[in-house]
Interface confidence: medium
């Protein structure tokens, strides 16, 4: 933004006319006292935007701040705004006028404040006085802002001399506001109730002897008043309690309940509010998703968690294959449902050192007299693979076969590999993968069986080798999601009299 003349402070003659120009790369506007005075806006051929503010027949009342700002950036950082301060010395204007409220300066702590008495002429000497005193106070004065410093709770006036005339400003009142010393807390027996149940709220004040309670609540707005009960908590000094009890709540009793407490000696006050919800009937709602297929690893512990909201408190049952589960005495299963907030619950099923037999269909059911919800999932027990057998044989057909058998859950993949150079394999040479597409003259036949009782897959794979002309290291590797296992056998040609 470019302002002409640049300022930052100008002194102009009374009754004169003056032109202010502001230009920028985006639309610009002049502001005076948060308003936009009449101005001429234009856009040049080179894409520059400008605004011209013509000040005519200037008076002392034109003294003050002028801002040029991008039209769409009001309220942004100061580098998006150019400030200009104009003085128009005018002997007919003493101190610049104030809004009545500007004459009050409110404080809550000891801090520097500004008494904003301003004059039209930067050459004038301005002094600050207590309203009832003649002595000038040693406080620095800024002609653009006023007197800044730390002030007592008093009334102050500013004085200046214009020609041979002494001029006083309006009185400014510095008010230190009271900070409430009341400590109020509000709580409810429950913030969610069913229609027909009771709403009971308590408002407690600590450390004050003489207080007045005022409750605001939805029923009050419709003219149906409820008389609160106030008592003292005898075991605690100066703990005063007001109880608001609404029997047989209606849906319209939902809303904000506010306890306003006034302390009559120092006239302090504080208020706290709480929201109450009245529901037509109870509810149970699942929160979040639980997949229909869950996994656990054999011999490891696994916790399955369900989060839900409910009111009133529900009964929670867990089932496996339609049979009710309970905490087992052997400590193999642990069930817990805990209340994490007034209406939110977490129910957990923990299987300790999971066994194959614990695979199956699990259901959690949460219910009360008004509603119920259930969540089901299948639990699969993952079993790391094991190679149970790796054997080599010489059928009469002349070919040589290697048979690999293994088990695991989920279904294992089988990988065959071979190595011809026994000395360098597998440390230096990578083994060659075998199979139907391998360069080896080999054939592969794999069968998979699912054993229901053990809840795992068995893989049997037979590798047929057509021509084995020198010793060969054959490796069978089984892999699944939870592990892998490998065994190795040395296959020797028929002609050789030994086997390793």
């Amino acid at each position: 933004l470019v302002v002409t003349p640049p300022g930052p402070e100008l002194v102009l003659n009374v009754s004169s006319t003056f032109v202010l120009t502001c230009s920028g790369s985006a639309p610009v506007v002049w502001e005076r006292m948060s308003q936009e005075p009449p101005q001429e806006m234009a856009k040049a051929q080179d894409g520059t935007f400008s605004s011209v503010l013509t000040l005519t027949n200037l008076t002392g009342l034109d003294t003050g701040e002028y801002f040029c700002t991008h039209n769409d950036s009001r309220g942004l950082e100061t580098d998006e705004r150019k400030r200009l301060y104009i003085f128009v010395p005018d002997p007919t204007v003493g101190f610049l006028p104030n809004d009545a409220e500007e004459l009050f300066i409110f404080l809550t702590e000891i801090t520097e404040i500004t008494i904003p008495c301003r004059v039209t002429d930067p050459q004038l000497v301005v002094t600050l006085h207590e309203k009832k005193g003649d002595v000038a106070l040693p406080v620095p004065y800024d002609h653009q802002r006023g007197f800044s410093g730390i002030f007592e709770d008093r009334s102050y006036i500013c004085k200046t001399t214009i020609g041979d005339r002494e001029v006083d400003s309006d009185a400014y009142y510095v008010y230190r506001l009271q900070v409430s010393s009341i400590n109020v807390s509000v709580n409810a027996v429950q913030t969610v109730v069913r229609q027909g149940e009771n709403i009971t709220l308590m408002c407690i004040v600590i450390g004050n002897e003489v207080v007045n309670f005022e409750w605001t609540y939805p029923r009050k707005e419709s003219g149906r008043l409820v008389e609160p009960v106030t008592d003292f908590l005898l075991d605690m000094p100066y703990h005063i309690r007001s109880i608001l009890h609404i029997p047989s709540a209606e849906l319209e009793d939902s809303g904000t309940y506010t306890c306003n407490v006034t302390e009559s000696v120092n006239d302090h006050q504080d208020e706290k509010a709480i929201n109450i919800t009245v529901v037509e009937s109870g509810y149970v709602r699942l929160l979040g998703e639980v997949g229909t297929l869950q996994f656990a690893e054999l011999h490891r512990s696994r916790t399955l968690q369900v989060v839900f909201e409910a009111y009133p408190p529900p009964t929670v049952l867990w089932f496996k294959d339609n049979r009710t589960l309970g905490d087992s005495s052997a400590g193999e299963i642990a069930l817990s449902t805990r209340n994490v907030s007034e209406t939110r619950y977490v129910s957990e099923l923990t299987l300790v050192r999971v066994k194959v037999a614990e695979a199956g269909h699990y259901t959690m059911r949460a219910f009360h007299e008004d509603a119920e919800v259930q969540l089901s999932f299948q639990l699969q027990i993952n079993v790391p693979v094991r190679v149970l057998e790796l054997s080599e044989s010489h059928p009469d057909s002349g070919e040589q076969t290697v048979r690999c058998r293994g088990r695991g859950m989920p279904q294992p993949n089988i990988i065959w590999s071979a190595c011809r150079d026994l000395k360098r394999c597998p440390r230096e040479l990578p083994p060659t993968l075998l199979g139907n597409s391998s360069e080896e003259e080999s054939q592969l036949e794999t069968n998979v069986t699912y054993w229901e009782e053990e809840q795992e897959f068995e893989v049997v794979s037979t590798l047929r080798l057509q021509h084995v002309d020198r010793p060969l290291s054959v490796r069978c590797t089984l892999r699944n999601a939870v592990g892998q296992d490998t065994q190795e056998v040395i296959v020797v040609p028929h002609s050789l009299p030994f086997k390793v």
Epitope: F104, F106, T108, S155, Y173, Y175, L177, Q178, V179, S180, E214, N260, T262, D267, H268, Q269
Partner: nanobody
Framework: EVQLVESGGGLVQAGGSARLSCAAS????????MAWSRQAPGKQREVVAL???????TYATSVKGRFTISRDDAKNTVYLQMNSLKPEDTNLYTC????????????WGQGTQVTVSS
Amino acid sequence: EVQLVESGGGLVQAGGSARLSCAASGSILSPNLMAWSRQAPGKQREVVALATSDGITTYATSVKGRFTISRDDAKNTVYLQMNSLKPEDTNLYTCKYRALRAGAVDYWGQGTQVTVSS
């Protein structure tokens, strides 16, 4: 909560007088201030007169000497006596209440229209 109800506005001849009243009800705390403000279209709201419960009164320069603010704390009511009215005093006059304490909020009435005809 504090409720404010203004009355007394209407049509007045230039040079004439009007008296506005504002009655406060609800949680009235002391000390407090009560004020009268006005807002012309396209202008900032201007507080023209203000009175505190401990007896301080102040006025905007534009109304000083013509308007007088007074209070009746027994009735929780503030008055604005408007004399020597000018056409530029035409406005919606709104009453405000604020407790003089930290964190207190301003409560405003609905306003009463004063129209000064020339």
